[in-house]
Each structure stands twice: as structure tokens, then as C-alpha cells.
Amino acid sequence: DGHGGSWEQLIQERRSHQNNPAAHLTGANSSLTGSGGPLLWETQLGLAFLRGLDYHDGALVANKAGYYYIYSKVQLGGVGCPLGLASTITHGLYKRTPRYPEELELLVSQQSPCGRATSNSRVWWDSSFLGGVVHLEVGEEVVVRVLDERLVRLRDGTRSYFGAFMV
Amino acid sequence: DGHGGSWEQLIQERRSHQNNPAAHLTGANSSLTGSGGPLLWETQLGLAFLRGLDYHDGALVANKAGYYYIYSKVQLGGVGCPLGLASTITHGLYKRTPRYPEELELLVSQQSPCGRATSNSRVWWDSSFLGGVVHLEVGEEVVVRVLDERLVRLRDGTRSYFGAFMV
Amino acid sequence: DGHGGSWEQLIQERRSHQNNPAAHLTGANSSLTGSGGPLLWETQLGLAFLRGLDYHDGALVANKAGYYYIYSKVQLGGVGCPLGLASTITHGLYKRTPRYPEELELLVSQQSPCGRATSNSRVWWDSSFLGGVVHLEVGEEVVVRVLDERLVRLRDGTRSYFGAFMV
């Protein structure tokens, strides 16, 4: 009927729509390396999954070019704050691309949670959420960084996480 | 032309893409029950809607299996804080499934907003946003909980809400 | 084969799925007008883009009716707080429609960040994120407002931004 090629494309697209790229990675004991590198993530256990995206050393890697809503939440907390900690904690999503030698800032938040302790208690908790749409080419990577990562609290993968899906 | 079955599927899919499951539920005076249960939500009035998802006693219920971006924001506020309140407020999204007897934590935040009052004023406001991709089977439910829910401020459905859409 | 019309629609839809409306606008030096109007945004440079949505005087404008996940983040910060500043900062997404004379609140957050300075430092940082699904008709607009906008910190488009995509 002359529609063969397009038909195959449509069939393929129907399948790929069911497989629209998406991922949700969760915090784990190994997430905080202390090495100055990005946070590392669980990709398979519990709530974590990869569908049409790859993972490599803390990075989500695009297999298909397009616009992605990327997001990350980190749970921050402590009893007081480390001496020498600036009054700012920075949580950001960064892109790695073969086209530039350095990581590119995508979405960034700065917070001053250490002043949040209630009277007579030095315990504080805070949470930082980032989300936004960015363009990724095939092979480009997105990572999460937190400075100072010592203040990230990990427990069970529900409080600190990292994900994306194509829009 | 031999494409009948697939054709019907495609036609169906076109319709269902227009009806990609999505919902946005808003806070209302009845949201806070004080019963220890999850928050309840407005499903029809104002900005609230359900499209391809059901609602039951505070829960969004999946009609179609797949990955969903689920989100919730709660507006917190008060003049000082209740005694006996730990310095933590917990805001979370939880899954109910016939496969487990207990709710499963999906996305959780902890915050210490009570220490945020400005000098001489005990008034404080804080907002907690959660969002992430989770897998839901048909009939599985997602609810929102806040501990201590007495600190959730409801007004007009714009400050505290709960939603989802399939990705 | 009697499927002509539907076939064309499907082909069209395949193309438009690739062009599912999406946008991400970034903060710039010109974002804060001090005029009492909404924040203005960069639409082309750096990470900013428009795909199937228009922009006009701070507003994202829908070209296609449907449900959109809209989001905004603003970076707040300062050294102390302006005298006369209420202990509340309001960050909101608002809809403009020909059907009403006034803007309609969609998603709103209130925060009290000025009390967040750490001991011995009056410097504070805070971030507010909003996101949720709303329905937009063709020509309806969404804008971002922050009261008091003097506390919004702009730098490079990564800390304060505004976006949307159809779900």
C-alpha cells in the first residue's frame, strides 16, 4: 500500500514509546567517595532502574539524542556543621560531553542549612531538589555533585536520588 | 492489508497518548485528618484533575502499568513549633501494593524548618518538594504523608499538592 | 484502504511527538525588572530553548492545548535581609488567560530564608523549586513571580530557571 517504510517506523516508534528513555538511581553507602568526584548511584536494586539510558561511574549516559527532564534530590543533615565549611552547600547537575574538556553546569542550588538547627539543638535536616529540561546528544553524560558531600545523608535510597526521562 | 491488528493498536495508542495518564490533586481543608492516615486531596475542583488515574482515600491509583513521574509539594509553616516535635519534619511519597502488607517508602525528605524564624519573629515558612520516577502496576497506589501534619498550611490548593504522569 | 485520514494523523503525530512541546528558560541579568512585573528569561542562549512553545514578556505561551508539567527554580540569597521585608518570600507560577482579568495562582511556595544565616555570618542561601501539571489552552500564558525579587540571585542561568513540557 506504499506505506511500508513509514509503517515500520510507526511500529518501531510504538515500541520505543513504551521504552521512552527513563531512569531513577538511588543513593547507597557507596555513593559518597570522598574523592572529589561525582556521587555514585545504585542502578538495579530496590527502586533503581535504567530504561534506555546507560550508567557509568556516577553518570547517566544518553543513548538517544533529545530533550530530557533530569532531576536529583539530596538529603542533607548533620549535628552542627564542619569547621571550615562555608555557609553554602552546592548541589548541582553537570553535563560531560566530548565537545568540552570541562563539565558544564546545568542546574545548581546553593543552600545554607547549617543555620537551621532549632534552639538548643544542633541537629538540622534539609533537602535540595533540582529538576529541569536539558538537551543530551548520544554519549553525553549527566552527573550529580554536592559540595560539601560530607553533609549528604544516605539511608535507603529514598532520600537522595537521581533520574531522568525523555520529554 | 494484514495490518489490521497492529493498526487498531496504533489507533488506540494515538488516543491513549492524548490520554497519557496524568493527575494533579490539590490541598483542601479536608486534607488534614489528624488520624495518622495519609493526606487527602481535592480531585475535581479548581486546578485538580484525574486523567487515566484513579483516586481513593488519599491515594493515586494506577490503571495502567508503567513508569510514572510522581511529585508532591507541601507548604509548611507556623509560629514556633509544638513541643515534642523532633527537629525533623518528614514528607514522603509511599506505595501501597497488594504484594506487601506495609507501605513502601518511595521518595522522602526530612527538614528542620522550625529553626528558621527570623530574629524576633517566630513565624516561619518552608516548602518541601519531592519528585521522581517509580514503577506502578495496575492497582498499586501512591500516598503522601507528612509528620507532623499539623505544620502543613492549606489555603487554596496552590501551596500543597500531589500529582503524577506516565513517562 | 480507508485508513488514509487516520494514517496522515499518525504520521503527523509521530513527527509532533518528536516535537512534543518543551521549553527551558534561564535567568539572566535582565530577569529582575524591579517593575512589579514577572521575572524575564533568556530563551535562546546557553541552555535555554523553546520547542513548540512561545515566549512573550516573561511568559511561556502555549501553542497547543493540553496538560503541561511546568516548573521553576529560583536561587535566593543575601547578607541579612532588607528592613521591612516580611519574614516570607513568595515564589509562584501564575496563569494569564483571556478568560479572566487577573492572573491565576497555579503553584506557589512561601519560605523564610532570612533566618537561615549560620552563626557569626549573616550570609544565607536558599532555593525554591516548584513543579506540577496544569492545563493550558492555546494562547494561555504562564509567568514566574518572586516577592521580594531583590533576594533572587542570578549568575549563569543554572540557579534560576523556568520550563515546561507537555505530558
Epitope: 534552639s119 538548643n120 539543638s121 | 509553616g77 509560629v79 514556633g80 513549633c81 513541643l83 515534642g84 513565624v123 | -
Partner: antibody
Framework: EVQLQQSGAELVKPGASVKLSCKAS????????MYWVKQRPGQGLEWIGE????????IFNEKFKTKATLTVDKSSSTAYMQLSSLTSEDSAVYYC????????????WGAGTSVTVSS | DIVLTQSPASLAVSLGQRATISCKAS??????????MNWYQQKPGQPPKLLIY???NLDSGIPARFSASGSGTDFTLNIHPVEEEDAATYYC?????????FGGGTKLEIK
Amino acid sequence: EVQLQQSGAELVKPGASVKLSCKASGYTFATYYMYWVKQRPGQGLEWIGEINPTNGGTIFNEKFKTKATLTVDKSSSTAYMQLSSLTSEDSAVYYCARGNWPYWSFDVWGAGTSVTVSS
Amino acid sequence: DIVLTQSPASLAVSLGQRATISCKASQSVDFDGDNYMNWYQQKPGQPPKLLIYAASNLDSGIPARFSASGSGTDFTLNIHPVEEEDAATYYCQQSIEDPWTFGGGTKLEIK
């Protein structure tokens, strides 16, 4: 019955200190903040400060920050206020009162302790 | 500090009539629709007694002849019908900002 029982009247010399007590009964001590209020003869009421009985955290009226010290003994459900460097301006009746979130009203008051500063 | 100005300083009301006491705050005591204004009654030689919390809510055990209203900066306490035992000094108090402050008091005398 909910009660706040305050210690008896005090006659003290200028420059001295005095410690007043307020014993709570009929409710769980740790679930209400304790407040102290001053009333000079024939005058109005002044809020001195509060103490959180769970952790000893205090908030003061700036005017009384160097004058008053608030403490609690959870084991005996008793709150204390020590007043130091007393002058004739400190001669007053001092009340303890309990209150709580969300509206911070003082719903139960002690009978008051009269403090007279005189040489 | 938030200054609470009560008026009148004193008033005399006949038995069975209405007593109205005003309390004006130097700034709003509203938070998200709740008003952090409380009213107390004090009789000579006794501690104050809570009558009204959050601008208009009657404390438990307080007779219904006491009522109060207001929002923002202007508040009113009403007693109707006035009884003999209502002779006392009445104070308003704000609890939204430190230091918590009291009005100067209004002395009610029964004629």
C-alpha cells in the same frame, strides 16, 4: 487537676540573688513550655521568657536576658527562675504559666511569688 | 516590639449591660489567617486567667457571655450581659513576635 505551685514570698537585699520555683502537677511536664511573667505593684504584665522542659532551651525578652536564668528539673516537674543583682526595680510578683503551640496562650498560671527588694 | 494599646483604661458598666474593650496592635498579629491575640482576666490578688485565645476562641470553662473578635491590628473583647463577678482588669496579649507583650489593661467596674 492541673496546677502550678509556686514558692513563697521572698524579702531580699539589693545586689543579692533569689531562686523561685514552680512545681507542675496534673499534666505531663514535658509537653508544655513554661513561661515567667512579671507584675510590678499596680502595674501591667511583662513577659520575661520561656523554657522548653524537654531540652532546657530558653528564649528571653531582651530586657531580662542578664537578669533572669531559667532552668528545669524534669525529675520533679519543677521550673526555676533565678533573678540576680536585685534592685528595687525587681520588686514584683512573678508568675509562672504554662502554654503551648499553636497559639502560645498561657492557659494555667501559678498563684505568683512576691519578691521584695529592700535593705 | 509590638505595642498593644488598650482602651478605655477603665470603664463602668451597669449589671446586665455590654462591656466592650478595644486592643490595637502596632503591627499585624496575623499569620496565615490565624490571629495571635489572647485575652486574660485578672482579679485583685489573683493570677491572670485565660479567657480567649487566637482572637476569638473561648477557653474551656469560660462562660459564653465572653466573646471576642478582630483581625490584623484591631481586636475587641465583649462581655454581655455583664455580671458582678466580671469586675476585674482585662489584658490583651500578642504571641506572634518576641518579646510577647501585654496591653496596659482595662479596669472594669460594675455599676
